[in-house]
Every structure is written in C-alpha cells, then in structure tokens.
Amino acid sequence: QPDAINAPVTCCYNFTNRKISVQRLASYRRITSSKCPKEAVIFKTIVAKEICADPKQKWVQDSMDHLDKQIQTPKP
C-alpha cells in the first residue's frame, strides 16, 4: 500500500508480488520523488484500492501502456 508520510509526497516501500489484470485497473501514477526510497508505479484499481508496483516489471509497463492507450482513445 502507498504511504504518505509528509503530504503531499506518497512513497511505496513494498511492491505487489501478484500481477493485476488490466481489466481491474482504472489509472496509474508514477512515483519519482527523490524523497522516496524507490521509484514506483501506483495503480488505482476499479475497486478504489491503490497498489504499489515495480516499474521494472514487464506486466507493469504493459499495463501502463494499456491505460495510456485507453486515455488516448476517445469513447464512442
């Protein structure tokens, strides 16, 4: 789970060890702050949970790409 120590900086200290289906993902944001111990991606899921993930993992990169394409494709 993401953890905000001194708002507004949110950091991730652990990454999920389970792949999340893109069908369960709503959005994401990157964590690149130098105040955080590691770079991370925080996925917001369709059930409103936020999950920390490792941006080096392929499934994380693929999921971000998928979400980016969803944003770029206008809904009919």
Epitope: R18, K19, I20, Q23, R24, T45, V47, K49
Partner: antibody
Amino acid sequence: QVELVQSGAEVKKPGSSVKVSCKASGGTFSSYGISWVRQAPGQGLEWMGAINPLAGHTHYAQKFQGRVTITADESTSTAYMELSSLRSEDTAVYYCARYDGIYGELDFWGQGTLVTVSS
Amino acid sequence: DIVLTQSPATLSLSPGERATLSCRASQSVSDAYLAWYQQKPGQAPRLLIYDASSRATGVPARFSGSGSGTDFTLTISSLEPEDFAVYYCQQYISFPATFGQGTKVEIK
C-alpha cells in the same frame, strides 16, 4: 485470522423470503468483497452474487437477478443476502466467502447456512 | 458467462497415486484468474490454488496447478487419505464468477 460467521438454519414457506447474515472478524471489512455461493443437496457450487463495500459495487448472477439482494453494513462488518419468492429448489446450503476485489479468489468461507423451503 | 467444464466427473484412485483433474473454459480466462477448491462432506470449500498455479497459504506442496487460456489442470502428485474429496475450479476474471461442476476423487 479472518473468520466469517453466518446466521443459523432457516425453514421457510414457498413464496416467502429469507435473509442470511455473514459477520466478518479479523480483517478490514471494507477492503474486501463478499461473495455468496449456494449448494443444493448433492449438487455443486453455484455463485449467486457479490458485494464490494469499498467500491460500492454489487454483482448478481443473471439466474438470481431480481430475486436476490446483497447488502453490507460496514459498522458491524456484516454482509447480508436476501432471497425472495422462495421455491423448493432454493433448498440449499448458502455460503458467504471473502474475496479481494482486485483479484477474486474466495480465500475465507463462512460455515454455511442451511435454508429449507417446504410447505 | 464463462462456462467451466471439469473432467472427469469421478476419479477412482488409490492412496499414493497421482491425480490429474481438468478444467476447460468456454472462453479464455485472461491473466489465469482461475482457482481450485477442495470440499469435503459437510464442510465449506477450501481454497487450494489461485491465479492458476499459486498455492494458497497452508496448502501442501503435493497440490499444484497449471494452465492458461482455456485449459487448466490440478495435479495431486501422491494422494493422501485426506485428499479424497470433491474439487471445483472457478474463474474470477469476470462476473458472474462461475464454478465448474466438480470432480469427485474417490478411493478405488
């Protein structure tokens, strides 16, 4: 340790309704969903529906749509399943089970509630 | 709805033998969001395997799951007396989260 404790056995008349409760302890209730699954005597498992309190989502199997209502009371960490217009074929053991809304496998189950529909 | 078909309906084996149970989906279960449960008479089901191949907490190593897409398998490498039960697969990629009809593993 997560525990789901269900209400006791019920005997109901055809056409009436039954409301089964499922009280959760040992976990963060609102962070998880509750599914309801039933099992008729000698038969397999049948998924009825689910509720995810955090997201406010409720899902029902088409077979039960309009007859089943699943609710949750976060203040008491209790989920409810109400089935109306009961018929003899609804005689079954009804289980509640916890799932993580991001995934969906049912990792903790209640002990089951036997509902008998008989005139 | 995704329909899951389990085979065989009944498997008659002796303790120590290997059990192979199959679960076939009517359409692809993406990201292998498939679970296996064990149920003994008079008891609630118990989660054995999730995400097709991950063992749930406390499940012995003799239970393993495999597969992707539409074909999934639960293997019990060497049957113990307590393993004789009914096994169900379930997909949870989409609602309704359907179950297979079950495979009964009985003592030969």
